[in-house]
C-alpha cells in the first residue's frame, strides 16, 4: 500500500508554495539587485531567502486548515441541509486538516528557528560592526529610531504566543493525548485556539510590514513583497469565519 | 461536563501570578520612570515585562508541584499515620500536579524563546550601535567586565540545562510515553529529576541576580526586584525537601 | 527491577564521550592558553567547552544508530545467511538503537539552544564592543569577509534542517505516533530520514570547519580540533551505507 | 566622605611644564568612578580638560591640542593632570571631580563630588 | 562639540523671589534609547569648587533643597528656584554630559537685587 496516504496533499501542497515563494523571493532579493546594480546577494540564499518562504508556507497552510470549514458552511448554508454530501475534493481536503496544521506548525517552528538565528550570522556581525563605524564617522550619538523598535517588540511578542499556541494544538494532536481528550476539549482546543494562532499569525505578518505598504521600494520590479501575497488567504478566512459568527448566520448553521 | 476540570485550578493560579507579576513589573519598569524622569519606557512591554513574568510564573508553579508534597509529609508526620484523609483542598492540589508542572514546562519554554529573541530585536541593535559609539567616544579600548561575563555564562547555561530536564518531564508526561514506563521509572523521573531541575532554576535566578540584592537601585519605589520574590517559594520548598531528606525524618516516613 | 535498562548502554556511552570530550576541550580551549601564555579563559567552560562537548556527542551517538546496521549488513554478507544469530554484543546494541537515536536528538536540541544563546552573552557583547573600536582605530570600513559569511549561511541553515529531520525522527518515536504508522512508514521514516539526518549533520560539520583542516593554528599542542574527530565514525558510516547501497550488493542482501 | 586635594599649582613660564594631584580620600580611585579635571580661568567659565575612567581610559578635550596628559597611581589613591608646552591662557583654577563609570543603562554621570581647586599661573 | 548657550548671562532677585535660568543645547541632549536627558546644574560660590544640583535635567542630587528644579528635554532647559534664599545667590551653570568633549553653559550670575 501507498506511505503516508493523508500526506500527500499538504505535502504536495506546501512544496508548490514554497518553491513558488522560493523562486520569487530569490527574484526580489538575489536576481534584481545582481541585474540592476551588479550586487552579489547570493550569502542570502541559505538563511534569509529560506526564511521568507517559510512563514509564507506556514501562515498559508494555516489558513488551509481553517478554510474548508468556511467553504463547508458556504456549502451548507447554500443547500439549506447537512445531509448533502459534500463534493469529493473538499472531503478529501476536510480529512488532511489535522496534516495541513502539523506541517504548517514544522514551518513556523523552522521559521522561529531560522528567526532567532540571525543574531549569530557572521554577515550580522559584519554588517553591525560597519553600522557602528558608520555612526562614529557621522557623528551620531543615538541610533534610535523608536517606531521601528516598537515594531519589532510588538511583532516578534505575538509571533512567539502565536507559535506558542500552535505548539499546543499540535502537542493535542498526538494520539494518545487526544486520546485523554474528551471529543469537546479536543474540538475546543482545535477551533478556538487555531483560529486564534491564525489570527496572531497574520497580525505578527502585518505589524513586520508596518508601513512598508507604502514604501515605493518595497515594490521590486513592480512586485509586491511577500508578505503582502502571504497575509491575503488568513485575512480571507478571518474576515468568512466573523461573518459564519455573526448571530444571524450561527444560528442559521446551528440549526442546519 | 466541564471543560478541562484538571486545569481550572493550575490555570487560574498561573493567571493571578501572571497578572500581580505584570502589573509589578510594570510599575517597576515603566510607571515609575515615567512618573519620576518622564522618562516613556512602554516599549518595553510587549517582550522585557512579559518576560519578566514568564519566569516568575513558571518557577511558582514547578515549586508548586513539589510543595504539596513536603505538606502531605508534614501532616502524615504530624498525624503519625498514611491512613487519614488529606484535607480537601490538597487532595484536590495533589491530583493536579501534573498540570502545574505542564504549564511550568509551557512557560519556561516561553521564557527560553523571548530571551533567545533579545540580541535580534531592533532595541538591543540600537543600544550596541549606542555603546560602541561611547566606547570610542571614551576612547575605551577593552569593555570586557570578567564578573558580569561570568555571571551571565553560568545562568544562561544552568538555564539551559534546567530547562532540558524539565523537557524530559513533560515528554514522559504524554500518557503513551508514561504507559511505557514502569511505576518505578515514572515516579523516579518526576520526583528526582522535578526536583533537580527545580534546583537549577532556583541557582539560575540568584545567579541571575547576581550581586543585585545589595544594589539599592534595584528597590524601585522600595519594592524589591521580581527575582527576589520569585525565588522565595521554590528555596521554601527545597529547604523542606532537604530536611525531610534527613535520615531521622525519612525513616520515619517510610515507616508511615 | 532495574530503572531504565535499555537506556543503559547509551547514557554509558553518552557519557565517555561527553566526559572524555569535555577534557579534551578544556586542554585546548582553556589549559592551553593558561600554559602557554598565561591567559584566563576558564569563563568558557559554562557555554562555549559545553558546546564544543554536545555536537560531537550527539553525532556520535546518530552515527552509533545506523552503524550496528552497517555491521549487521557485512555479517549477513559474510555469513552468507540471515539466519545465524548475531553477536550478543551486536544483538544488545541493535536493540538500543532508538534510545540512540532519542539521546542523540536531545545533545542536538541543547547543541542548538546553546548555539542562539550565543549572541545574548554579554562576553559576546563586550567582544563585539571591543572589534567596532578596532574597526574606527583601523579606519577600517568595511568588515565583510565573504567566505566567513557564507560558511556560516551555509552551516547553520544545514544544521537547522538536519536538527528538523531529527526532531521528525523522535516525534514518531512516541509510542501513540508510531502505533499510528504502518511498520512500512515506520521503517521508511527511520531509516531513509535517520541517515539524511546524519548527512546533514556530516555536512553541518564539515562547512563549519570549512578551511580549517589546514589551519596550523588549530592544532593545538598537536591535537586536531574537535570537529575532526567528531566527523571520522559518520563519515564511516555514510561510506559503509553508500557500499552497501550499490546495487550488486543491495541485491546480495534483499537475496539473504 | 569623599574627600578631593588637588596640589601641584603655582606659577609656571610659558612653555613651562606642570604636574597637579589629586588626591582621593574615603573612595578607592579605581572603584566605580572616572575622574575628571575641569579648570576655570579667572572670572570666566568652567571649561573640561579631560578624564580617566576606572579602567584606565583617557579622554581630552581636542581643544588642548595633545598637551595634557591624565595618569593615576592607584597604590596612592592619586591622579595627575601633566601639562606641558603652557601658555598664558592655561591659567586658571583646576578642578579634579569624580563621576559615576559609565555603564550599558545610564551611559553616562554627571560629576558629583569636586576637590576645592588649585590655581596655576601661567606667566614669564 | 555640543554648545551651551544660557541665559541671562545675570540676574538681579530678592529673596522669595522665583528665579528661572534657561539653557539651549546646539543639539539634543536625549537619549532616545534610555529616555534620558544628559544635563546637569551646578551652583558655584565665589572661591568655592562647583557642587551638583540637578542631574538628567530634572534629578535633584540628594540633601538639595526642594526649591531648586529642572525641567526641560532635548534642546531645551530650565532651573527654577520658586523660593530664592539668601544663601541661593551664587553662579549656576549647566553642562552637557551626552558627549565628549563634556561642555558648560557661560554662567548665570544671580546678585541680590
Known amino acids: 500500500q501507498e506511505l503516508f496516504p493523508q500526506w500527500h496533499l499538504p505535502i504536495k501542497i506546501a512544496a508548490i508554495i514554497a518553491s513558488l515563494t522560493f523562486l520569487y523571493t530569490l527574484l526580489r532579493e538575489v536576481i534584481h539587485p545582481l541585474a540592476t546594480s551588479h550586487q552579489q546577494y547570493f550569502y542570502k540564499i541559505p538563511i534569509l531567502v529560506i526564511n521568507k518562504v517559510l512563514p509564507m508556507v506556514s501562515i498559508t497552510l494555516l489558513a488551509l486548515v481553517y478554510l474548508p470549514g468556511v467553504i463547508a458552511a458556504i456549502v451548507q448554508l447554500h443547500n439549506g441541509t447537512k445531509y448533502k454530501k459534500f463534493p469529493h475534493w473538499l472531503d478529501k481536503w476536510m480529512l488532511t486538516r489535522k496534516q495541513f496544521g502539523l506541517l504548517s506548525f514544522f514551518f513556523a517552528v523552522l521559521h522561529a528557528i531560522y528567526s532567532l538565528s540571525y543574531p549569530m550570522r557572521r554577515s550580522y556581525r559584519y554588517k553591525l560592526l560597519n553600522w557602528a563605524y558608520q555612526q562614529v564617522q557621522q557623528n551620531k550619538e543615538d541610533a534610535w529610531i523608536e517606531h521601528d523598535v516598537w515594531r519589532m517588540e510588538i511583532y516578534v511578542s505575538l509571533g512567539i504566543v502565536g507559535l506558542a499556541i500552535l505548539a499546543l494544538l499540535a502537542v493535542t494532536s498526538i494520539p494518545s493525548v487526544s486520546d485523554s481528550l474528551t471529543w469537546r476539549e479536543f474540538h475546543y482546543i482545535q477551533s478556538k485556539l487555531g483560529i486564534v494562532s491564525l489570527l496572531l499569525g497574520t497580525i505578527h505578518a502585518l505589524i513586520f510590514a508596518w508601513n512598508k505598504w507604502i514604501d515605493i521600494k518595497q515594490f521590486v520590479w513592480y512586485t509586491p513583497p511577500t508578505f503582502m501575497i502571504a497575509v491575503f488567504l488568513p485575512i480571507v478566512v478571518l474576515i468568512f469565519k466573523s461573518i459564519l459568527f455573526l448571530p444571524c448566520l450561527r444560528k442559521k448553521i446551528l440549526k442546519i | 461536563q466541564e471543560l478541562f476540570p484538571q486545569w481550572h485550578l493550575p490555570i487560574k493560579i498561573a493567571a493571578i501570578i501572571a497578572s500581580l507579576t505584570f502589573l509589578y513589573t510594570l510599575l517597576r519598569e515603566v510607571i515609575h520612570p515615567l512618573a519620576t524622569s518622564h522618562q516613556q519606557y512602554f516599549y518595553k512591554i510587549p517582550i522585557l515585562v512579559i518576560n519578566k513574568v514568564l519566569p516568575m510564573v513558571s518557577i511558582t508553579l514547578l515549586a508548586l508541584v513539589y510543595l504539596p508534597g513536603v505538606i502531605a509529609a508534614i501532616v502524615q508526620l504530624h498525624n503519625g499515620t498514611k491512613y487519614k484523609k488529606f484535607p480537601h483542598w490538597l487532595d484536590k492540589w495533589m491530583l493536579t500536579r501534573k498540570q502545574f508542572g505542564l504549564l511550568s514546562f509551557f512557560f519556561a519554554v516561553l521564557h527560553a524563546i523571548y530571551s533567545l529573541s533579545y540580541p535580534m530585536r531592533r532595541s538591543y541593535r540600537y543600544k550596541l550601535l549606542n555603546w560602541a559609539y561611547q566606547q570610542v567616544q571614551q576612547n575605551k579600548e577593552d569593555a570586557w567586565i570578567e564578573h558580569d561575563v561570568w555571571r551571565m555564562e553560568i545562568y544562561v547555561s544552568l538555564g539551559i540545562v534546567g530547562l532540558a530536564i524539565l523537557a524530559l518531564l513533560a515528554v514522559t508526561s504524554i500518557p503513551s510515553v508514561s504507559d511505557s514506563l514502569t511505576w518505578r521509572e515514572f515516579h523516579y523521573i518526576q520526583s528526582k529529576l522535578g526536583i533537580v531541575s527545580l534546583l537549577l532554576g532556583t541557582i539560575h535566578a540568584l545567579i541571575f541576580a547576581w550581586n543585585k540584592w545589595i544594589d539599592i537601585k534595584q528597590f524601585v519605589w522600595y519594592t524589591p526586584p521580581t527575582f527576589m520574590i520569585a525565588v522565595f517559594l521554590p528555596i521554601v520548598v527545597l529547604i523542606f525537601k532537604s530536611i525531610l531528606f534527613l535520615p531521622c525524618l525519612r525513616k520515619k516516613i517510610l515507616k508511615i | 527491577q532495574e530503572l531504565f535498562p535499555q537506556w543503559h548502554l547509551p547514557i554509558k556511552i553518552a557519557a565517555i564521550i561527553a566526559s572524555l570530550t569535555f577534557l579534551y576541550t578544556l586542554l585546548r580551549e582553556v589549559i592551553h592558553p593558561l600554559a602557554t601564555s598565561h591567559q584566563q579563559y576558564f569563563y568558557k567552560i559554562p557555554i562555549l567547552v559545553i558546546n564544543k562537548v554536545l555536537p560531537m556527542v550527539s553525532i556520535t551517538l546518530l552515527a552509533l544508530v545506523y552503524l550496528p546496521g552497517v555491521i549487521a549488513a557485512i555479517v549477513q554478507l559474510h555469513n552468507g545467511t540471515k539466519y545465524k544469530k548475531f553477536p550478543h554484543w551486536l544483538d544488545k546494541w541493535m536493540l538500543t538503537r532508538k534510545q540512540f537515536g532519542l539521546l542523540s536528538f536531545f545533545f542536538a536540541v541543547l547543541h542548538a539552544i546553546y548555539s542562539l544563546s550565543y549572541p545574548m552573552r554579554r562576553s559576546y557583547r563586550y567582544k563585539l564592543l571591543n572589534w567596532a573600536y578596532q574597526q574606527v582605530q583601523q579606519n577600517k570600513e568595511d568588515a565583510w569577509i565573504e567566505h566567513d559569511v557564507w560558511r556560516m549561511e551555509i552551516y547553520v541553515s544545514l544544521g537547522i534542517v538536519g536538527l528538523a529531520i531529527l526532531a521528525l525522527l523522535a516525534v514518531t518515536s512516541i509510542p501513540s505516533v508510531s502505533d499510528s504508522l504502518t511498520w512500512r512508514e515506520f521503517h521508511y521514516i527511520q531509516s531513509k530520514l535517520g541517515i539524511v539526518s546524519l548527512l546533514l549533520g556530516t555536512i553541518h560539520a564539515l562547512i563549519f570547519a570549512w578551511n580549517k583542516w589546514i589551519d596550523i593554528k588549530q592544532f593545538v599542542w598537536y591535537t586536531p580540533p574537535t570537529f575532526m574527530i567528531a566527523v571520522f565514525l559518520p563519515i564511516v558510516v555514510l561510506i559503509f551505507k553508500s557500499i552497501l547501497f550499490l546495487p550488486c550488493l543491495r541485491k546480495k542482501i534483499l537475496k539473504i | 566622605e569623599v574627600q578631593l586635594v588637588e596640589s601641584g599649582g603655582g606659577l609656571v613660564q610659558p612653555g613651562g611644564s606642570l604636574r597637579l594631584s589629586c588626591a582621593a580620600s574615603g573612595y578607592s580611585i579605581t572603584s566605580d568612578y572616572a575622574w575628571n579635571w575641569i579648570r576655570q580661568a579667572p572670572g570666566k567659565g568652567l571649561e573640561w580638560v579631560g578624564y580617566i575612567s576606572n579602567s584606565g581610559s583617557t579622554s581630552y578635550n581636542p581643544s588642548l591640542k595633545s598637551r595634557f596628559t591624565i595618569s593615576r597611581d592607584n597604590s596612592k589613591n592619586t591622579l595627575y593632570l601633566q601639562m606641558n608646552s603652557l601658555r598664558a591662557e592655561d591659567t586658571a583654577v583646576y578642578y579634579c571631580?569624580?563621576?559615576?563609570?559609565?555603564?550599558?543603562?545610564?551611559?553616562?554621570?554627571?560629576?558629583?563630588?569636586w576637590g576645592q581647586g588649585t590655581l596655576v599661573t601661567v606667566s614669564s | 562639540d555640543i554648545q551651551m548657550t544660557q541665559s541671562p548671562s545675570s540676574l538681579s532677585a530678592s529673596v522669595g523671589d522665583r528665579v528661572t535660568i534657561t539653557c539651549k543645547s546646539s543639539?539634543?541632549?536625549?537619549?532616545?534609547?534610555?529616555?534620558?536627558?544628559?544635563l546637569a546644574w551646578y551652583q558655584q560660590k565665589p572661591g568655592k569648587a562647583p557642587k551638583l544640583l540637578i542631574y538628567?535635567?530634572?534629578t535633584r542630587e540628594s540633601g538639595v533643597p526642594s526649591r531648586f528644579s529642572g525641567s526641560g528635554s532635548g534642546t531645551d532647559f530650565t532651573l527654577t528656584i520658586s523660593s530664592l534664599q539668601p544663601e541661593d545667590f551664587a553662579t549656576y551653570y549647566c553642562?552637557?554630559?551626552?558627549?565628549?568633549?563634556?561642555?558648560f553653559g557661560q554662567g548665570t550670575k544671580v546678585e541680590i537685587k
Open positions: 538628567w535635567a530634572s
Open positions: 553642562q552637557q554630559y551626552y558627549n565628549y568633549p563634556r561642555t
Open positions: 543639539q539634543s541632549l536625549l537619549y532616545r534609547s534610555n529616555q534620558k536627558n544628559y
Open positions: 571631580a569624580r563621576e559615576r563609570n559609565y555603564d550599558y543603562d545610564d551611559y553616562y554621570y554627571a560629576m558629583d563630588y
